[in-house]
């Protein structure tokens, strides 16, 4: 037989089909010019010593073969003995190691078989009524196709599906969408209405995420508040990566899961913007405020479930940083200014009450005064911190108040509101004899002592009613008792106690009279 002709004889090897899974597959045959034809196939398995034979049977009952050697592509003309106008069946037999391996048959009319391309270029993927919709432009001059898809998950083999006939400039396919696993899709096409025409190659992989993005399993930690009033939020555990099918590993556009961080600053509710969304990779610095942090996972089909954490406020207080002066016109706070043109947010809430009851005020951008201080004033009529109780005050600062992640904590401290000097006056002052020349003075704790850092000291004043001499004794804010010694028997004394803050002298308690009785010896 001539090499250019199909040989109408028994093949030069015994028929010993191995039935193995490897071997020739994906045989495609088509016309490539007016009188020339091509068949190509793939071979799976070791290629050493393999000889391929393209087999052809005609409807007349005769069969022939082309010897292709080690090649997996073969061209022939319409003069090679193969009927091109009538239906023929073709397959490949690969002879190796004393056995034959067969490809599946293709049955077609060669003359009408055009080489079809798989979907080329961009395949658009969208979700439609719980299914996956793929859409692509029909390859040039190939309108009218039958389309198939195959799909697999990381744990399942390929499954074949049908897209149905296509007859337009754009083609589309509805495919199953998995809820929780990524899928790899490939598409192939063949000429519509041409009995037995060959399938195109499979398209490049189309990688599709699950309908539900994986729930982020992450943990955060927050560092200590730094000197600049900011603390870093750090990710303790990265989100688990989505398992991908084989063809989507490495570069898999389409299956990306985007994790975003949504910050909600709970403190200082009077600021302009309370939430900000960031990429998870860019961990922000936060002020000492309380925050809710949500991690939102999303893919090309939209957001999934999110996970939310609460980051409590940093309650570290600096009792001396804030000066408060109470005048007839109202109250003014002073604190060390941060920088030029800063906006401050002053937040206060009664101690022991729910954080939801916080009140705040936003200052206009201000520069430091000549002493380097920033200020905030309010009148008595405003009612701010007007009740005689302990308030927790936090001051935040930002040069860009519209940017949530640029706030910093200036200070946190406690303040006793209303008329603190009067409200803080100690009550229930009592005097007990202690010795021949001393007494013990006790009092109930000042209301100011409920406010950490506010009560600087108690002062006990003792007045000799005879000589009008006065002595004052400072007492630690944690103490409610003092011993007065060096007293004289028979002399009348009055004792008073006051509670002082760092910026305010207290009001004396009601004078308490006492005297040490003269001891008469027997």
């Amino acid at each position: 037989c001539r090499t250019s002709e199909c040989c109408f004889q028994d093949p030069p090897y015994p028929d010993a089909d191995s039935g193995s899974a490897s071997g020739p597959r994906d045989l495609r045959c088509y016309r490539i010019s007016s009188d020339r034809y091509e068949c190509s196939w793939q071979y799976e398995g070791p290629t050493a010593g393999v000889s391929h034979f393209l087999r052809c049977c005609l409807s007349s009952g005769r069969c022939c073969y082309f010897a292709a050697g080690s090649a997996t592509r073969l061209q022939f003309s319409d003069q090679a003995g193969v009927s091109v106008l009538y239906t023929v069946t073709l397959w490949v037999e690969s002879w190796a190691r004393n056995q034959t391996e067969k490809s599946p048959e293709v049955t077609l009319q060669l003359y009408n078989s055009v080489k079809y391309e798989p979907p080329l270029g961009d395949i658009k993927v969208s979700k439609l009524a719980g299914q996956l919709r793929m859409e692509w432009e029909t390859p040039d001059n190939q309108v009218g196709a039958e389309v198939q898809f195959r799909h697999r998950t990381p744990s399942s083999p390929w499954k074949l599906g049908d897209c149905g006939p296509q007859d337009d400039d754009t083609e589309s396919c509805l495919c199953p969408l998995e809820m929780n696993v990524a899928q790899e899709f490939q598409l192939r096409r063949r000429q519509l209405g041409s009995q037995g025409s060959s399938w195109s190659k499979w398209s490049s992989p189309v990688c599709v995420p699950p309908e539900n993005p994986p729930q982020p399993q992450v943990r955060f930690s927050v560092e200590q508040l730094g000197q600049d009033g900011r603390r870093r939020l750090t990710l303790k555990e990265q989100p688990t990566q989505l398992e991908l099918p084989e063809g989507c590993q490495g570069l898999a556009p389409g299956t990306e899961v985007t994790y975003r961080l949504q910050l909600h600053m709970l403190s200082c509710p009077c600021k302009a913007k309370a939430t900000r969304t960031l990429h998870l990779g860019k961990m922000p610095y936060l002020s000492g405020a309380a925050y809710n942090v949500a991690v939102i996972s999303s893919n090309q089909f939209g957001p999934g479930l999110n996970q939310t954490w609460h980051i409590p406020a940093d309650t570290h207080t600096e009792p001396v940083a804030l000066n408060i002066s109470v005048g007839t016109n109202g109250t003014t706070m002073y604190w060390p200014a941060r920088a030029q043109s800063m906006t401050y947010c002053i937040e206060w809430q009664p101690v022991g009450q729910d954080g939801g009851l916080a009140t705040c005020s936003l200052t206009a951008p201000q520069d430091p005064d000549p002493a380097g201080m920033a200020t905030y004033s309010w009148s008595r009529e405003s009612g701010a911190m007007g009740q005689e109780k302990c308030y927790y005050i936090t001051i935040f600062a930002s040069a860009h108040p519209e940017k949530l992640t640029l706030w910093s904590t200036v200070l946190s401290t406690y303040h006793f509101g209303g008329n603190a000097s009067a409200a803080g006056t100690p009550h229930h002052v009592s005097v007990k004899n202690h010795s021949l020349d001393s007494v013990s003075v006790d009092w109930a704790p000042s209301l100011l002592s409920t406010c950490p850092g506010v009560l600087k000291e108690y002062v006990v004043r003792c007045r000799d009613e005879d000589s009008k001499q006065v002595s004052e004794h400072p007492v630690q804010p944690t103490e409610t008792q003092v011993t007065l010694s060096g007293l004289r028997a028979g002399v009348a004394y009055t004792v008073q106690v006051r509670a002082d803050t760092a910026w305010l002298r207290g009001v004396w308690s009601q004078p308490q009279r006492f005297s040490i009785e003269v001891q008469v010896s027997d």
Epitope: C57, G61, C63, T89, K102, P104, E105
Partner: nanobody, 126 residues
Framework: EVQLVESGGGLVQAGGSLRLSCAAS????????MAWFRQAPGKEREFVAG????????HYVDSVKGRFTISRDNGKNTVYLQMNSLKSEDTAVYYC???????????????????WGQGTQVTVEP
């Protein structure tokens, strides 16, 4: 040992249908083109229908075209003959036969076939 076992024959009224099956064992079924022959009393065995190893091509004798359909299931090592609109002249013993698919995939004469079954009787009453 190669065995081809036919089944599905029987008595049927004219115009009725039957489906014959031929189960193969002891051979690599997908290497063989298969055919159905029939032999009426006092006549020679005649070719009815043939099919290539993968089922891509089929061939029928003119007298059964449009009425009979040959098919195969390589997973089940079985070839079938669906016979519709049966006529009394279809009465015969039906045999299935197999041949390696070398330079031909069917022969109209029995001598081109390597293996044969024992046959199944089909009787069509007028």
């Amino acid at each position: 040992e190669v065995q081809l076992v036919e089944s599905g024959g029987g008595l049927v009224q004219a115009g009725g249908s039957l489906r014959l099956s031929c189960a193969a064992s002891g051979l690599t079924f997908r290497n063989y083109a298969m055919a159905w022959f029939r032999q009426a009393p006092g006549k020679e065995r005649e070719f009815v229908a043939g099919i290539t190893w993968g089922g891509g091509l089929t061939h029928y004798v003119d007298s059964v075209k449009g009425r009979f359909t040959i098919s195969r299931d390589n997973g089940k090592n079985t070839v079938y003959l669906q016979m519709n609109s049966l006529k009394s002249e279809d009465t015969a013993v039906y045999y299935c036969a197999g041949k390696t698919q070398g330079s031909t995939w069917y022969h109209l004469t029995p001598d081109g076939y390597d293996y044969w079954g024992q046959g199944t009787q089909v009787t069509v009453e007028p």
